[in-house]
Interface confidence: medium
């Protein structure tokens, strides 16, 4: 179990409000605000790398020790690479020193170096090189030190800079306890972590009522380490058969509940759509008409297949249809509902019908759908379509009936324009197109999409009301992919096939590719 940390000082959480002492005043360490991950962050920073003989101190406020015997100091900081400065900054350093001083009272602004004892030289694992600095990649180092035993009422920490370019982003001081612990139905009391214990303190646990040490098992014991962690658990307690763990105690299973093994798990209520169980039952049978899927746990309610999708609409949009439906009114008690969409097309003239799975395109695979909508495209004009949406769940396979709803739609979409290349130059292509006259009255505009062959990253779009367009500002001797699509009030008509047209080369030669 993790140690319980009792925080005595947290610079990062204070939002720049602590007001630590800097010496000499106005030089060296400086409180700065920056932005990281769109949040303001405070740091104490110093970067006097060009001047030798630096001796800049930053002292925390006085920290009350309380019951702490050993304190832990966690530092988060960044150090800039001395080589990232012009000329290498010969007096530049890449470390700083950590000090502490104990006292029974707060000295305020009276700072005396001689009272401080060095804990360690703090060196970064990673320095911030020029490229990281430029890219705003903060190479954050985390170092932890501990000091103890402490005996006075409080203490200070101090940071000595001797010519580094360093920023302190977080200073956290805390001490540790082994927290009160309930583990495996055994209770262990809260224990203050000692300051300097060569061996682990053994703490005996006691089983809660109606919990026992399993036959052949050991009595529960834990060890409280210096860092406040419980270590080396030995033994455990488990609830007796027919009992469950309730608020760290063992309680008998009630009628209508079941628990089929001795374990740490609770007694489980007979789920919905099962027959009530007697006291001490190991399972609960399903009511008639309800089922369990092979993978369903015993704790899950018995369920049944869903009803049909409640409401199904088919909205035609040119060459596409958007199918939308609402979930079944009766889910059967399950959350694993999936939908399958099937398609049938009928020729209006002959009334002949057939499946159309292979000729249409779905926005996502039509079987095993979890969403309640799908778009069907590549529909043929002047065709009637019937779509069936079936709802299924994990127990649908246990019955023979199906739950589905159907919707029909007629496609009256424009035919694809027939495109021709009328003329070309080194930098332009003149393109025209036609569609059957009866359909022209429904067209609002034509959309011409073109791009260089082989360039899938960008394309150009021109809209026009006429039947031709000149595409200019093109590259010489270059093949362009051109497609024309009619736009109607109902949406997009069918697109023409993609044509390849090539501009002339500057010499005037070049083949016509249609």
């Amino acid at each position: 179990a993790q140690g319980k940390e009792v925080v005595l000082l947290d610079f990062a959480a204070a939002g720049g409000e602590l007001g630590w002492l800097t010496h000499p005043y106005g030089k060296g360490w400086d409180l700065m605000q920056n932005i990281m991950n769109d949040m303001p962050i405070y740091m104490y920073s110093v970067c006097n790398v060009m001047s030798g003989d630096q001796d800049n101190w930053l002292r925390t406020n006085w920290v009350y020790r309380g019951e702490a015997e050993r304190i832990f100091i966690e530092l988060k900081f960044t150090v800039r690479d001395c080589n990232s400065f012009p000329g290498g900054a010969s007096s530049c350093k890449e470390t700083f020193n950590l000090y502490y001083a104990e006292s029974d009272l707060d000295y305020g602004t009276n700072f005396q170096k001689r009272l401080f004892t060095k804990i360690d030289t703090i060196a970064p694992d990673e320095i911030t090189v020029s490229s990281d600095f430029e890219a705003r990649h903060v190479k954050l180092n985390v170092e932890e030190r501990s000091v103890g035993p402490l005996t006075r009422k409080g203490f200070y920490l101090a940071f000595q800079d001797i010519g580094a370019c360093v920023a302190l982003l977080s200073v956290r001081v805390y001490y540790k306890k082994c927290p009160e612990l309930l583990q495996s139905l055994a209770r262990f009391p809260e224990t203050i972590a000692g300051s300097d214990a060569p061996s682990l303190a053994t703490v005996a646990g006691t089983c809660v009522d109606h919990a026992v040490v399993p036959p052949g098992g050991e009595e529960p014991r834990m060890h409280c380490a210096v860092d406040g962690e419980w270590l080396v658990p030995i033994g455990q307690c488990l609830c007796q058969a027919g009992y469950e763990k309730v608020e760290d105690a063992c309680q008998a299973c009630s009628p209508g509940f079941f628990k089929f093994e001795v374990s740490e798990s609770p007694c489980l209520e007979c789920p919905e759509h099962t027959l009530p169980s007697p006291e001490g039952a190991t399972s609960c049978e399903c009511e008639e008409g309800f089922f369990r899927a092979p993978q369903d746990p015993m704790s899950m309610p018995c369920t049944r297949p869903p009803s049909a999708p409640h409401y199904l609409t088919a909205v035609g949009m040119g060459a596409k249809v958007e199918l939308r439906w609402t979930p079944p009114q009766d889910s059967g008690g399950r959350e694993d509902i999936v939908y399958s969409v099937t398609c049938e097309q009928c020729w209006p003239e002959s009334g002949e019908c057939g499946p159309c799975e292979s000729s249409v395109r779905y926005s996502e695979p039509p079987h095993g759908l979890t969403r309640t909508s799908v778009t069907v495209s590549d529909l043929e004009p002047h065709m009637n379509y019937t779509f069936t949406v079936e709802a299924r769940n994990g127990v649908s396979g246990l019955v023979t009936s199906r739950s589905f709803r159907t919707a029909s739609v007629s496609i009256n979409q424009t035919e694809p324009p027939k495109v021709r290349l009328e003329g070309r130059s080194t930098t332009s292509l003149s393109v025209s197109w036609s569609i059957p006259p009866p359909q022209q009255s429904r067209v609002w505009k034509y959309e011409v999409t073109y791009r260089k062959k082989g360039d899938s990253n960008s394309y150009n779009v021109r809209r026009t009301e006429g039947f031709s367009v000149t595409l200019d500002d093109l590259a010489p001797d270059t093949t362009y992919l051109v497609q024309v699509q009619a736009l109607t009030q109902e949406g997009q008509g069918a697109g023409s096939k993609v044509h390849e047209f090539q501009t002339l080369s500057p010499e005037g030669s070049g083949s016509l590719a249609v």
Partner: antibody, heavy 128, light 107 residues
Framework: EVQLLESGGGLVQPGGSLRLSCAAS????????MAWVRQAPGKGLEWVSR????????HYADSVKGRFTISRDNSKNTLYLQMNSLRAEDTAVYYC?????????????????????WGQGTLVTVSS | DIQMTQSPSSLSASVGDRVTITCRAS??????LAWYQQKPGKAPKLLIY???NLHTGVPSRFSGSGSGTEFSLTISGLQPDDFATYYC?????????FGQGTKVEIK
């Protein structure tokens, strides 16, 4: 000595395009963040765009986003600004400017940059 | 965007005077502020970065101070070469906005 020399300015009609260049010398171009800053006649300075030392990331002022493109060729020590769909309000002297983090004596970089070195500027006039 | 407001927009002073220009940010920018000097027909020159750090080669009569939203540029002992327009610029946000400028003229 650091030198930045802009070129490519001139008179252009609204809706037209121009490409500005900035030739750099006297320093290691590939270490520098580069930027374009403009100054309309009789007005103050306006940051336009920036590009990182190795070509990214790029940022643009809202007023030029989607119309201007900043790029660089470190092998030629040259910075570019492709300006399309020009408007009358784009009329200004365009300065190329640079920043080298090595000369910035702070432990953690500022969120953006300032500009240590500037070119002499090139005038772009958008008028019909 | 962060707005930068300089005051005054212009001032008249004599050689040897102590001149202070202020710059106010519409929101806190810590100390991410630079000052530039520009003479007519010339490019701007960097004077101060990070609110108070003197750029290489800039005379020590120029000094900057402030943090958060209030900043100032001081010229202690104005020289003939110092008559120019001065701009502040924030670089806390990627929009990198400038103040509208302060013109220092000969009285």
């Amino acid at each position: 000595e650091v030198q930045l020399l802009e070129s490519g300015g001139g008179l252009v009609q609204p809706g037209g395009s121009l490409r500005l260049s900035c030739a750099a010398s006297g320093f290691t171009f590939s270490h520098y963040m580069m930027a374009w800053v403009r100054q309309a006649p009789g007005k103050g300075l306006e940051w336009v765009s920036r590009i990182g030392p190795s070509g990214g990331p790029t940022h643009y002022a809202d007023s030029v986003k989607g119309r201007f493109t900043i790029s660089r060729d470190n092998s030629k020590n040259t910075l570019y600004l492709q300006m399309n769909s020009l408007r009358a309000e784009d009329t200004a002297v365009y300065y190329c400017a640079g920043y080298d983090s090595g000369y910035d004596y702070v432990a953690v970089a500022g969120p953006a940059e300032y500009f240590q070195h500037w070119g002499q500027g090139t005038l772009v006039t958008v008028s019909s | 965007d962060i707005q930068m407001t300089q005051s005054p927009s212009s001032l008249s002073a004599s050689v040897g005077d102590r001149v202070t220009i202020t710059c106010r940010a519409s929101q806190s920018i810590s100390t991410w502020l630079a000052w530039y000097q520009q003479k007519p027909g010339k490019a701007p020159k960097l004077l101060i970065y990070k609110a108070s750090n003197l750029h290489t080669g800039v005379p020590s009569r120029f000094s900057g101070s402030g943090s958060g939203t209030e900043f100032s540029l001081t010229i202690s002992g104005l020289q003939p070469d110092d008559f120019a327009t001065y701009y502040c610029q924030q670089y806390q946000s990627y929009s990198r906005t400038f103040g509208q400028g302060t013109k220092v003229e000969i009285k």
